[in-house]
């Protein structure tokens, strides 16, 4: 393991596909992948009238957009389906939406609001 990197070996698993088929597929997913590739966890969800509906959670494989992210945070502004990924065991247990605002006029005292967390 490279110093400072969180190795991902397992992730929280949920799959709405399986839920609707009444097979109760939730649990902990072991992440497998090529030796030279990095492994991540992810969460994807929808916000339907303020209600969070999880679509899937589990392992995600070697995506540069997930490198060195310890928290699962969606930064896109108002996506149709929210997605975040992270590194570290079970790091997708909690996920959040924290859009990166386009800053047109910098303020003298920028404030970073705390992202809303879901779990």
């Amino acid at each position: 393991a490279i110093l400072g990197r969180s190795e991902t070996q397992e992730c929280l698993f949920f799959n709405a596909n399986w839920e609707k088929d009444r097979t109760n597929q939730t649990g902990v997913e072991p992440c497998y992948g090529d030796k030279d590739k990095r492994r991540h966890c992810f969460a994807t969800w929808k916000n339907i009238s303020g209600s969070i509906e999880i679509v899937k959670q589990g392992c995600w494989l070697d995506d540069i957009n997930c490198y060195d992210r310890t928290d699962c945070v969606e930064k896109k502004d108002s996506p149709e389906v929210y997605f975040c990924c992270c590194e570290g065991n079970m790091c997708n247990e909690k996920f959040s939406y924290f859009p990166e605002m386009e800053v047109t006029q910098p303020t003298s005292n920028p404030v970073t609001p705390k992202p809303p967390y879901y779990n």
Partner: antibody
Framework: QVQLVQSGAEVKKPGSSVKVSCKAS????????ISWVRQAPGQGLEWMGG????????NYAQKFQGRVTITADESTSTAYMELSSLRSEDTAVYYC?????????????WGQGTMVTVSS | EIVMTQSPSSLSASVGDTVTITCRAS??????LAWYQQKPGKAPRLLIY???MLRSGVPSRFSGSGSGTHFTLTISSLQPEDFATYFC?????????FGPGTKLEIK
């Protein structure tokens, strides 16, 4: 690296059943996501269903519900697909496939395929 | 059921060309889209997963893009071994469905 080896070709009569096996070599069989996909001669690909052996329960495409049974035996690292009430349109190559992840990111390792011919 | 369509259904190209194949989903599938290559008498081979991630061992001339309902597979600098049939597949919602395929032939 997982390898999937399937049972040999079958010729079946209409109305009968066929059971195709898929033996996995390598580690972690119980916690793999195994799917079954078929391809009729000269046609496209059709997902039939899948199973994670440690869970034991399978997920089926509605089209095959009631006619297909997917099972797995962890002790022998073997997955099975049984299709009943066979008809001529079930003539196809049947593949067992390992998925990259439990959430079905991509079908990355394929068996060699089993040709099932349904003919009277 | 999510219906996948591909265009074109076939195309002719020459070695060294760049080609693009399009796949559309009847409903949004987020990033749950994969691309496969199949040669006659062989099992399909995974090329791209997660819409744009290259499977280990697949040459970098293959690339995928898109999200939601519209996806593309691009093959740059075609090689003789690239002439085959290409399928897209969504695995966002069961039943997982494949596109009808695009046959890439030598001009």
């Amino acid at each position: 690296q997982v390898q999937l080896v399937q049972s040999g070709a079958e010729v079946k009569k209409p109305g009968s059943s066929v059971k195709v096996s898929c033996k996995a070599s390598g580690r972690h069989f119980g916690s793999l996501q195994i799917s079954w996909v078929r391809q009729a001669p000269g046609q496209g690909l059709e997902w039939m269903g899948g199973i994670i052996p440690i869970y034991g329960t399978a997920n089926y495409a509605q089209k095959f519900q009631g006619r297909v049974t997917i099972t797995a035996d962890e002790s022998t690292s073997t997955a099975y697909m049984e299709l009943s009430s066979l008809r001529s349109e079930d003539t196809a190559v049947y593949y067992c496939v390992k998925d990259l992840t439990w959430t079905n990111l991509g079908l990355d390792i394929w068996g060699q395929g089993t040709m099932v011919t349904v003919s009277s | 059921e999510i219906v996948m369509t591909q265009s074109p259904s076939s195309l002719s190209a020459s070695v060294g060309d760049t080609v693009t194949i399009t796949c559309r989903a009847s409903q949004g599938v987020s990033r749950w889209l994969a691309w496969y290559q199949q040669k006659p008498g062989k099992a399909p081979r995974l090329l791209i997963y997660g819409a744009n991630m290259l499977r280990s061992g697949v040459p970098s001339r293959f690339s995928g893009s898109g999200s939601g309902t519209h996806f593309t597979l691009t093959i740059s600098s075609l090689q003789p071994e690239d002439f085959a049939t290409y399928f897209c597949q969504q695995s966002y919602s069961t039943p997982f469905t494949f596109g009808p395929g695009t046959k890439l032939e030598i001009k």
